[in-house]
Amino acid sequence: CKAMHVAQPAVVLASSRGIASFVCEYASPGKATEVRVTVLRQADSQVTEVCAATYMMGNELTFLDDSICTGTSSGNQVNLTIQGLRAMDTGLYICKVELMYPPPYYLGIGNGTQIYVIDPEPCPDSDF
């Protein structure tokens, strides 16, 4: 595989509403016009696919309707947002980028972003 460098932040803290956002940037060696982005989660040496989207440059980045991910693209950057996270979802989220068209095919895998998710404390009952 022709390798490509992918950069992503080392650590991100999810919001109290369980939303985490990070940028995945790739160094395109060619004139990429169709890109596939996949978010993988690594926890306890197991890797699972969180979400994936293929997009044409200049077009919206669209994930499946039931996906927990949303995103936008700008040049060689993809802004990814993962929603509905809970404490048990804490882990390393890896950005995988594939340049699908035009040929040749390139693959790049980031080092991962450690996303920390802290479940909000339940509100104490308040007397009115």
Partner: antibody, heavy 120, light 112 residues
């Protein structure tokens, strides 16, 4: 149903330019790349280049570099291929074709072809 | 550029009999991602080309299952298990491993 309808036959003199159009229907125009391929009389197929309808980004065969211009008008779902400084060996049928990602970027629908004759 | 070479140039066939077309590439089309970037197209007389097979062995939608594709990294075969009259035309192999996309010279299949 998916259709690519091309402009009619053209006769051009050497040194002139020709612009072929390809009107798409039956699918979302900006979701697929358009390729251009030509076929000289009695010959095989030759790739000219492609265009991304979203941003107008193109890739072209170096053989045609500097002579070919590919453009789109998304408002009318039409792609254009212009070839300049025509020579007699540019006489060919010119095809537009849609790329399909599910088929790993194969050309799944083709226009009917436009015959361009270059003759003095 | 990757050169695609087809043989034979012409193939006379008998309806109901099998037929086979060969294609060779000057470079392996098997990528390390496991995909073989080899395609087959058919151009029937007076028509535009149509896609038959993608990724060496996958039939495009609507293509009869009498067609099949196989091969290695550089040597490929298109087989028709039982030729029908409507199968006549020129068959082209093509690659999109690298730009420029290139096609074979074509194999003309005609009824004996």
């Amino acid at each position: 149903q998916v259709q690519l309808v091309q402009s009619g036959a053209e006769v051009k003199k050497p040194g002139a330019s020709v612009k072929v159009s390809c009107k798409a229907s039956g699918y979302k125009f900006t979701d697929h790349f358009i390729n251009w391929v030509r076929q000289a009389p009695g010959q095989g197929l030759e790739w000219i280049g492609d265009i991304n309808p979203n941003n107008g980004g193109t890739n072209s065969n170096q053989k045609f570099e500097g002579r070919v211009t590919m453009t789109v008008d998304t408002s009318i779902s039409t792609a254009y291929m212009e070839l300049s400084r025509l020579r007699s060996d540019d006489t060919a049928v010119y095809y537009c074709a849609r790329l399909r990602r599910e088929y790993f970027y194969a050309m799944d629908y083709w226009g009917q072809g436009t015959l361009v004759t270059v003759s003095s | 550029d990757i050169v695609m070479t087809q043989s034979p140039l012409s193939l006379p066939v008998t309806p109901g009999e099998p037929a086979s077309i060969s294609c060779r590439s000057s470079k392996s089309l098997l990528h390390s991602n496991g995909i073989t970037y080899l395609y087959w197209y058919l151009q029937k007389p007076g028509q535009s080309p149509q896609l038959l097979i993608y990724q060496m062995s996958n039939l495009a939608s609507g293509v009869p299952d009498r067609f099949s594709g196989s091969g290695s990294g550089t040597d490929f075969t298109l087989k028709i298990s039982r030729v029908e009259a409507e199968d006549v035309g020129v068959y082209y192999c093509a690659q999109n491993l690298e730009l420029p996309l290139t096609f074979g010279g074509g194999t003309k299949v005609e009824i004996k």
